[in-house]
């Protein structure tokens, strides 16, 4: 159910060399909870490095340093997992390298358990003083998201205390989780109040409830398991742009879409244009005109500039990217005023990247 | 999890037509491009050409421009490719893929007079 | 169109052995190149992509290399079950051409 005619072909074409797009899937880098991490920004020539967490700016505090090309994040908490990017910004141009990072205990496949503290986690309480269950250490349970790669080891603990000691279960996605239900099972560690799931699939994502009862009470906690798939994606556009913008007839307005892509992408530049007068095609779809698309002959294709507009050119503009695995697109509107109104670009929204499928 | 399920085999004659359906699960449809590979008996891959759940794009091979069609059904999830003016060169396994990454099983494709 | 030469076609191997398959382009793809396994009556199975990554699943003995016009897969310990028919393909532009293959048969 194609949602537009096309004036042009907007079939997947030879893509341009990949000098603007980070082709590969971003670095993971890996920091347990307390650790020191410092990360270098790869990217050449850089006149001014600017970083982004989440898509929002990240600057200096007392745990982050940005330091040159440096950025060091100094007794790393599970807040600082997320994607990273850095821009140098040059006369010419821009650039922008993204990362994650991932603040986890998470073990890593292979390795056996690694708790070194689980005696001080199985509390005995004096048989006399009859007490409902109780968490003996939140710290290990701040993190509620887990995002691992496919096939790593995951471990939940629910450290907890309580007389008589409580007894520990665990449900998926609110019903009883059974070994049955993964292939390989699962290890339950009930001295280190822990479920450990090695050789994590996809099919393991779901929430994680740790139930922790005794005759005096019952609490839990709930994790969100997300297994990260290696395997490529469709291209990933930076939130707000292109931006909405103004100007006088006769001037000139540049829209940019920033691309993150892990396979080569194809851009095209699109408007609603007229055809015979009309605005829409016999089959009621809008007509659209390829302004511009990534090719040999074509320079930054992230940067659509258009030169002395005219009122016709007011209207949206649309970015749409595409590589084997899929497509996304964001637009703009250009509005174009008359001689004698100044002038003025619209307010860019900044907002965090979407995270697609 | 993610799964491909390709229509059953087809015995065609030559000038024929064949629909062979894909049906996809386990994820967001309109999200990736559905790609046809088809392989002649004892030969290698060749790729046919692909569609865009969300919006209908497609792209193909100059060499089947003319005689394949590729349609997507989002209320079923489903993407079908049609071969026309078929000839004994078209017998192959004709096979689906989610952006190369997850693959249906393979239909096979039999022309014969 | 894009030509994709694979070398060898065919080779012989033992259970331990370390192997290498080479692909190459006609023209600089740049790192657009996943390679692909295929065993008799079944789909391909996607190994490596972008390349140099390794898909979901996929054993760590394999590994690929390369870009521009030049690319390699590599299989460190050779294992009874990657007997197999293996397909290089260009994904940096339409039509997305495959390798000849190279079919790794036992020693």
């Known amino acids: 159910r194609p949602s537009f005619s096309l004036v042009e072909d907007t079939t997947l074409e030879p893509e341009e060399p990949p000098t603007k797009y980070q082709i590969s899937q971003p670095e993971v880098y890996v920091a347990a909870p307390g650790e020191s991490l410092e990360v270098r920004c790869l990217l050449k020539d850089a006149a001014v490095i600017s970083w982004t967490k989440d898509g929002v700016h990240l600057g200096p505090n007392n745990r982050t340093v940005l330091i040159g090309e440096y950025l060091q994040i100094k007794g790393a908490t599970p807040r600082d997992s997320g994607l990273y990017a850095c821009t140098a910004s040059r006369t010419v141009d821009s650039e922008t390298w993204y990362f994650m990072v991932n603040v986890t205990d998470a073990i890593s496949s292979g390795d056996d358990e690694d708790d070194t503290d689980g005696a001080e986690d199985f509390v005995s309480e004096n048989s006399n003083n009859k007490r409902a269950p109780y968490w003996t250490n939140t710290e290990k349970m701040e993190k509620r998201l887990h995002a691992v790669p496919a096939a790593n080891t995951v471990k939940f603990r629910c450290p907890a205390g309580g007389n008589p000691m409580p007894t520990m279960r665990w449900l998926k996605n609110g019903k009883e989780f059974k070994q049955e239900h993964r292939i390989g099972g699962y290890k339950v560690r009930n001295q280190h109040w822990s479920l450990i799931m090695e050789s994590v699939v996809p099919s393991d994502k779901g929430n994680y409830t740790c139930v922790v009862e005794n005759e005096y009470g019952s609490i839990n906690h709930t994790y969100h398991l997300d297994v990260v798939e290696r395997s490529p994606h469709r291209p990933i556009l930076q939130a707000g742009l292109p931006a909405n913008a103004s100007t006088v007839v006769g001037g000139d307005v540049e829209f940019v879409c920033k691309v993150y892509s892990d396979a080569q992408p194809h851009i095209q530049w699109i408007k609603h244009v007229e055809k015979n007068g009309s605005k829409y095609g016999p089959d009621g779809l809008p007509y659209l005109k390829v302004l511009k698309h990534s090719g040999i002959n074509s320079s930054n294709a992230e940067v659509l500039a258009l030169f002395n507009v005219t009122e016709a050119d007011a209207g949206e503009y649309i970015c749409k990217v595409s590589n084997y695995i899929g497509q996304a697109n964001q637009s703009a509107w250009l509005t174009v005023l008359p001689k004698q109104q100044a002038p003025g670009r619209e307010k860019e929204i900044t907002a965090s990247p979407d995270y697609l499928e | 999890q993610v799964q491909l399920v390709q229509s059953g085999a087809e015995v065609k004659k030559p000038g024929a037509s064949v629909k062979v359906s894909c049906k996809a699960s386990g994820y967001i449809f309109t999200n990736y491009y559905i790609h046809w590979v088809r392989q002649a008996p004892g030969q290698g891959l060749e790729w046919m050409g692909a569609?865009?759940?969300?919006?209908?794009?497609?792209s193909y091979n100059q060499r089947f421009k003319v005689r394949a069609t590729l349609t997507a059904d989002t209320s079923t999830s489903t993407v079908y490719m049609e071969l026309s003016s078929l000839r004994s060169e078209d017998t192959a396994v004709y096979y689906c893929a989610r952006a190369f990454t997850y693959w249906g099983q393979g239909t096979t494709v039999t022309v014969s007079s | 169109d894009i030509q994709m030469t694979q070398s060898p076609s065919s080779l012989s191997a033992s259970v331990g052995d370390r192997v290498t398959i080479t692909c190459r382009a006609s023209?600089?793809?740049?790192?657009?190149l996943n390679w692909y396994q295929q065993k008799p009556g079944k789909a391909p199975k996607l190994l490596i992509y972008g390349a140099t990554n390794l898909a979901d699943g996929v054993p760590s003995r394999f590994s690929g290399s390369g870009s521009g016009t030049d690319f390699t897969l590599t299989i460190s310990s050779l294992q009874p079950e990657d007997f197999a028919t293996y397909y290089c393909?260009?994904?940096?532009?339409?039509?997305?051409?495959f390798g000849g293959g190279t079919k790794v048969e036992i020693k």
């Open positions: 393909q260009n994904v940096l532009s339409t039509p997305y051409t």
């Open positions: 023209e600089n793809i740049y790192g657009a």
């Open positions: 569609i865009y759940p969300d919006n209908g794009d497609t």
